[in-house]
Interface confidence: medium
């Protein structure tokens, strides 16, 4: 039996299609401001967006098994539709100006449309034909259409106000919508032609749906749900009154989700997404930044990309021809991300959270979350404040500085402590970057009145000051072993400089229009940096051919940036510390001749076997 479903801020309700029946709330907890609504009839589930929580959720019709399926990177997800054949979820976000897709459980998320979108609002799917339709509310309101993979985009209805409630009559092949500027209910054929006004005397129609011979709509002025004949607009009936702010309305019935396409059968044999395209075809789609393999069925994860962090988010960006948009990685419980790094071998992301005073790691999909360094060591009555980190991928160690103890620590990637490698009465090590290819680490030392940039062997020995003049607050370091260059940003002097790894050939790379540089990274021939005050990522071509370029603007609360290059496994295995840490119990160092020597943290000494460390 068909019935109406509608979202009304803090609840989602159902009501009979007939008049004067009571509406019944679906027992859902934690709904704050439900906006868009849709269903999957075969699963007997409803899906909704919440513009206060900035989530997309689902539950069974009885309210059970409530779960958030998308909870990152949403701003105002005000349009949403279920692809019942491909088992995909589509949504439009007026804040991010993106139309995205994922599986119904939120997996394999991809951005389909992101260029030249101005406040996309209502969204409707025609999966049997392979088209999606949406309205835009921006400077030039319109109704657009594209294939369900985002291709073949075209404007169908250019001369329209803010169109809402976009609905498809699948049987008669017509589009219906409400116009919030003209207060009309209109209809057209599937090409936007043959346009007809169905109702022109309504005070404020908002949401709209169609079922059999009727259209059903909500009216914000009359505070009602009403219906009328879908072609003539006659035989009007109020289904229910006294309803404020009904956001979306739909008819729950299997006839609204019929048809067939290739995606309905074994996901089109696609490894990730199966996306319908006209007419009746499909393409396999990949999660954001993944690439489709030559078999046109399976996908490969990106191996080269940029990570950048904001206060409570870590984002990934790829540099490609399509100018693919950056995405937020679905990592929970980020409070105040200060620094990030990446292990390309295990494909794990590492970060320092300065609110929780810990170092954590996780996979890019948010799974396998693990605390590597905890905020306090009760047995030693020791509070720590990690400041910066750098991974030695060969020895599988993290080098990290601590604001509370003013030392450089080494911890295994599995969280076991190696020990302190650098500690001094006057020392205040802050930024740190390791160069395990040569056996060195570089760090900024923000001593009172005499900031320095220093170099030391990875065990803290062979320590030397590279720079002590022309520095005020060197806040960030980056290193490129291939180029043999060290880079640093000084947030007080507002400039970015570089030198050779020995400290020779110091030059100022950029010192104009930099306000608050807080992070640096090298990516191919480009040096990228983030400016927290200008909320911007910029880059400069180190070959001098292309100069300085803005990469992205309007990114609030930036904290760090890190380039990830594809790991050459053959090269990796040739590093003498890559095999079982070179046989060393603690620190493995590469000597100038390419051989290794073992060493120890400060509290231990090297034993006679020259491999193991023990108590002095």
């Amino acid at each position: 039996e068909a019935f109406l479903l509608f979202s009304r801020r803090a609840d989602i309700r159902r009501i009979s299609l007939e008049t004067n029946n009571n509406n019944v709330a679906i027992p859902l907890t934690g709904v704050k401001e439900a906006s868009a609504l849709d269903f999957d009839v075969t699963d007997n589930r409803i899906y909704w967006t919440d513009i206060s929580l900035k989530t997309i959720s689902r539950a069974f019709m009885n309210g059970s098994a409530l779960e958030h399926v998308v909870e990152f990177g949403l701003d105002y997800p005000e349009g949403m539709a279920v692809d019942w054949l491909g088992k995909n979820l589509y949504w439009a976000d007026t804040g991010t100006n993106r139309i995205e897709v994922s599986k119904l459980d939120g997996q394999h998320r991809q951005v389909l449309v992101w260029k030249d979108l101005d406040s996309p609002r209502a969204l409707a799917l025609d999966p049997a034909e392979g088209f999606m339709y949406w309205t835009e509310w921006g400077g030039k309101p319109k109704i657009d259409r594209a294939a369900m993979d985002g291709s073949e985009r075209t404007t169908l209805v250019p001369n329209v106000g803010r169109a809402n409630g976009l609905t498809i009559d699948y049987a008669k092949r017509r589009l219906y919508w409400t116009d919030l500027d003209t207060n009309l209910i209109e209809s057209s054929n599937m090409l936007g032609l043959n346009r007809e006004v169905i109702a022109d005397d309504l005070p404020h129609p908002f949401g709209l749906t169609q079922y059999q011979d009727y259209i059903y709509w909500t009216d914000w002025s009359r505070r009602s749900i009403e219906r009328a004949n879908k072609t003539s607009g006659q035989n009007r009936t109020i289904i229910q009154g006294h309803l404020d702010y009904v956001m979306d309305i739909l008819v729950f019935h299997s006839s609204r989700q019929s048809g067939w396409n290739e995606c309905a059968s074994s996901n089109g044999h696609c490894s990730h997404l199966c996306l319908a395209v006209p007419v009746g075809g499909f393409v396999c789609g990949c999660p954001a930044h993944y690439s489709l393999n030559a078999d046109n069925r399976t996908c490969s994860a990106p191996t080269t990309f940029l990570l950048f962090s904001q206060k409570s988010a870590i984002n990934r960006m790829v540099i490609d021809e399509q100018q693919s948009p950056d995405i937020i990685l679905p990592i929970h419980s980020l409070r105040n991300v200060r620094a990030i790094d990446y292990d390309p071998l295990d494909k794990q992301l590492y970060w320092i959270d300065s609110r929780q005073n810990m170092i954590r790691k996780a996979q890019e999909d948010g799974s396998q979350g693990f605390t590597v360094v905890v905020s306090s060591v009760p047995s030693q009555n020791l509070e720590i404040q990690p400041y910066d980190l750098s991974i030695d991928i060969y020895s599988r160690y993290i080098y990290w500085t601590c604001e509370a103890t003013n030392v450089i620590n080494v911890t295994r990637l599995d969280g076991r402590s190696v020990g302190v490698v650098l500690k001094g009465e006057q020392d205040r090590p802050r930024a740190v970057v390791v160069n395990p290819e040569k056996g060195y680490m570089y760090f900024t030392n923000l001593q009172e009145r005499s900031p320095k940039i220093e170099r030391a062997a990875l065990d803290g020995t062979e320590r030397e000051v590279l720079f002590f003049s022309g520095l005020s607050k060197p806040i960030a370091l980056a290193l490129d072993s291939r180029l043999g260059k060290l880079f640093w940003a000084d947030s007080d002097l507002r400039r970015i400089e570089s030198s050779d790894l020995s400290g020779a050939n110091r030059i100022v790379l950029e010192d104009s229009n930099i306000l608050q540089p807080v992070g640096l990274t090298v990516f191919e021939n480009w040096l990228y940096w983030i400016d927290k005050q200008q909320q911007m990522i910029e880059k400069i071509d180190m070959t001098g051919r292309e100069g300085r370029t803005k990469v992205q603007a309007r990114i609030a609360q930036l904290s760090d940036i890190h380039a990830v290059k594809e790991l050459n496994l053959q090269e990796y295995r040739q590093h003498p510390c890559a095999q079982d840490n070179g046989g060393c119990s603690h620190i493995c160092l590469v000597k100038g001749d390419g051989t290794t020597r073992c060493s120890c943290p400060m509290h231990l000494v090297l034993l006679q076997d020259e491999l193991s460390c023990g108590e002095p």
Partner: nanobody, 119 residues
Framework: DVQLVESGGGLVQAGGSLRLACAGS????????IAWYRHPPGNQRELVAM????????DYADSVKGRFTISRNNAMKTVYLQMNNLKPEDTAVYYC????????????WGQGTQVTVSS
């Protein structure tokens, strides 16, 4: 983010006119309710006029009906308040406010512009 900048305030004689403008930046200015509030000296802030994205919906405070007119130009992301037949009791700091028509998820305020009506 939506940022609001008011202009057009000033000193005017009773019976005179002023036109306030509220310029908005931000991608979704056109889908917000825009309102003018005022904060008279020694009193509470009060709603003067509101215009919804649906242009037919306009509300005025009883004290300004027939004298003030609110209008919006979505293309220019600007909302105007035409104030005629001003009275000394209209003296206040006038603020522009932008709020989503549904729910309390977002609300923005301008810095305000001073209107002084002398008798």
């Amino acid at each position: 983010d939506v940022q609001l900048v008011e202009s057009g305030g000033g000193l005017v004689q009773a019976g005179g006119s002023l036109r306030l403008a509220c310029a908005g930046s931000g991608r979704i200015f056109a889908i917000y309710d825009i309102a003018w509030y005022r904060h008279p000296p020694g009193n509470q802030r009060e709603l003067v006029a509101m215009i919804r994205p649906v242009v037919t919906e306009i509300d005025y405070a009883d004290s300004v009906k027939g004298r003030f007119t609110i209008s919006r130009n979505n293309a220019m992301k600007t909302v105007y308040l035409q104030m005629n037949n001003l009275k000394p009791e209209d003296t206040a700091v006038y603020y522009c406010n932008a709020k989503r028509p549904w729910g309390s998820a977002d609300e923005y305020w301008g810095q305000g512009t001073q209107v002084t009506v002398s008798s």
